[in-house]
């Protein structure tokens, strides 16, 4: 159940896909990855106001309980709903290999 | 890759399963659910310090970039890794039915 996609906080403030440019050094990968030298990392950032992109029933419950007990129950959180695969050229004991990672780049986002 | 399960912030402070008691009224379910009257809602609450219960490569990236750009990139977030099913006795147009929900109660937690 992907609930409302309208952000009541204003354009771009709610949970959505952002791109952050990061070097191998930024990611702590310089010692085991050869390429790419820089990654356009897609990640989920933004607020999750009431029922915005609620991933499931659990997210709806969390919203209700956060409204009641904000100090105890946190609001839902903006996380990846799915991922885009990515390859890395990585160092091995004997040389290099091309490895695919399925859980590295966010493809779309929801609140949970 | 479920990384370290040791919480550097002290016992119980990091991402883990919590139980919150909630009534049908608390949940906004009173108009469509008959039973149970009260639910022991299990949810994921707590901090996600560096590499604690990192769900995947994306969570590890998020940790690294949060350390570099804390104002831009949020820390990973504590969310359900899996769910326990739950049945609800709910009202229907013609009476009641027993419905199973697979995404209602968190079973265990990770950081993403």
């Amino acid at each position: 159940a992907r609930n409302g996609d309208h952000c009541p906080l204003g354009p771009g403030r709610c949970c959505r896909l952002h791109t952050v440019r990061a070097s191998l050094e930024d990611l702590g990968w310089a010692d085991w990855v050869l390429s790419p030298r820089e990654v356009q990392v897609t990640m989920c950032i933004g607020a999750c106001p009431s029922q915005f992109r609620a991933a499931n029933m659990h997210a709806q419950i969390k919203t209700s309980l956060h409204r009641l007990k904000p100090d105890t129950v946190p609001a839902p959180c903006c996380v990846p709903a799915s991922y885009n695969p990515m390859v890395l050229i990585q160092k091995t004991d004997t040389g290099v290999s091309l490895q695919t990672y399925d859980d590295l780049l966010a493809k779309d986002c929801h609140c949970i | 890759a479920r990384n370290g399960d040791h919480c550097p912030l002290g016992p119980g402070r990091c991402c883990r399963l919590h139980t919150v008691r909630a009534s049908l009224e608390d949940l906004g379910w009173a108009d469509w659910v008959l039973s149970p009257r009260e639910v022991q809602v299990t949810m994921c609450i707590g901090a996600c310090p560096s590499q604690f219960r990192a769900a995947n490569m994306h969570a590890q990236i998020k940790t690294s970039l949060h350390r570099l750009k804390p104002d831009t990139v949020p820390a990973p977030c504590c969310v359900p890794a899996s769910y326990n099913p739950m049945v609800l006795i709910q009202k229907t147009d013609t009476g009641v039915s027993l419905q199973t929900y697979d995404d209602l109660l968190a079973k265990d937690c990770h950081c993403i």
Epitope: N84, P85, L104 | -
Partner: antibody, heavy 118, light 107 residues
């Protein structure tokens, strides 16, 4: 496993055009960092890189041949196409496609032969 | 475009010999040179990436070195299946360019 298969070769008239297909399996062209390139080899000669296309649809071409080449992809069909216009005798060659991961060309097809002759 | 000049263009050698091929780039390409092996009627096979890194499954008798403009490819002890044509290729910038090839043949 990764396989690539070129097709579309054969006899082409000078001044005509050729359209080659590269169908592949074992990888996806929607994966970040993946591309498909075309390389050719004239009879008894060395290798000449022609063009490549990336997962994000960025395209690069051999400088000398750029005006005659078009490269495109159909991600859902796992196919990449190379079109060459205004062909001449010196375009006679075996045309290979290769899988690319950034600047690695690690898997190659077996090639398709193009002969330009009247 | 960056020119890649390989030498020698051919060499005759025997099983067990050490073989060295050189490749010179027309401008600095850092370590961005790959090496390929091609047998008659077959597609090239990828051997070495970024001057010195053997690709997955490539035997350790194959090695590479160099940076800037001068690169070397070595087969430490030639095996019967190593008789082939070897190409260097710069992957520093597009258009990617190959050397003209070195044919390693039986003496």
């Amino acid at each position: 496993q990764v396989t690539l298969l070129e097709s579309g070769g054969g006899l082409v008239q000078p001044g005509g055009s050729l359209r080659l297909s590269c169908s592949f399996s074992g990888f996806s062209l929607s994966t970040y960092g993946i591309g498909v390139g075309w390389i050719r080899q004239a009879p008894g000669k060395g290798l000449e890189w022609l063009a490549h296309i990336w997962w994000n649809n960025n395209k690069y071409f051999n400088t000398a041949l750029k005006s005659r080449l078009t490269i495109s992809k159909d991600t859902s069909k796992n196919t990449v196409y190379l079109q060459m216009n205004s062909v001449r005798a010196e375009d006679t060659a075996v045309y290979y496609c290769a899988r690319m991961g950034y600047d690695i060309m690690d898997y190659w097809g077996q090639g398709t032969t193009v002969t330009v002759s009247s | 475009d960056i020119q890649m000049t390989q030498s020698p263009s051919s060499l005759s050698t025997s099983v067990g010999d050490r073989v060295t091929i050189t490749c010179k780039a027309s401008q600095d390409v850092n370590t961005a040179v790959a090496w390929y092996q091609q047998k008659p009627g077959k597609a090239p096979k990828f051997l070495i990436y970024s001057s010195s890194y053997r690709y997955t499954g490539v035997p350790d008798r194959f090695s590479g070195s160099g940076s800037g403009t001068d690169f070397t490819f070595t087969i430490s002890s030639l095996q019967p299946e190593d008789f082939a044509v070897y190409y260097c290729q710069q992957h520093y910038s597009t258009p990617w360019t190959f050397g003209q090839g070195t044919k390693v043949e039986i003496k």
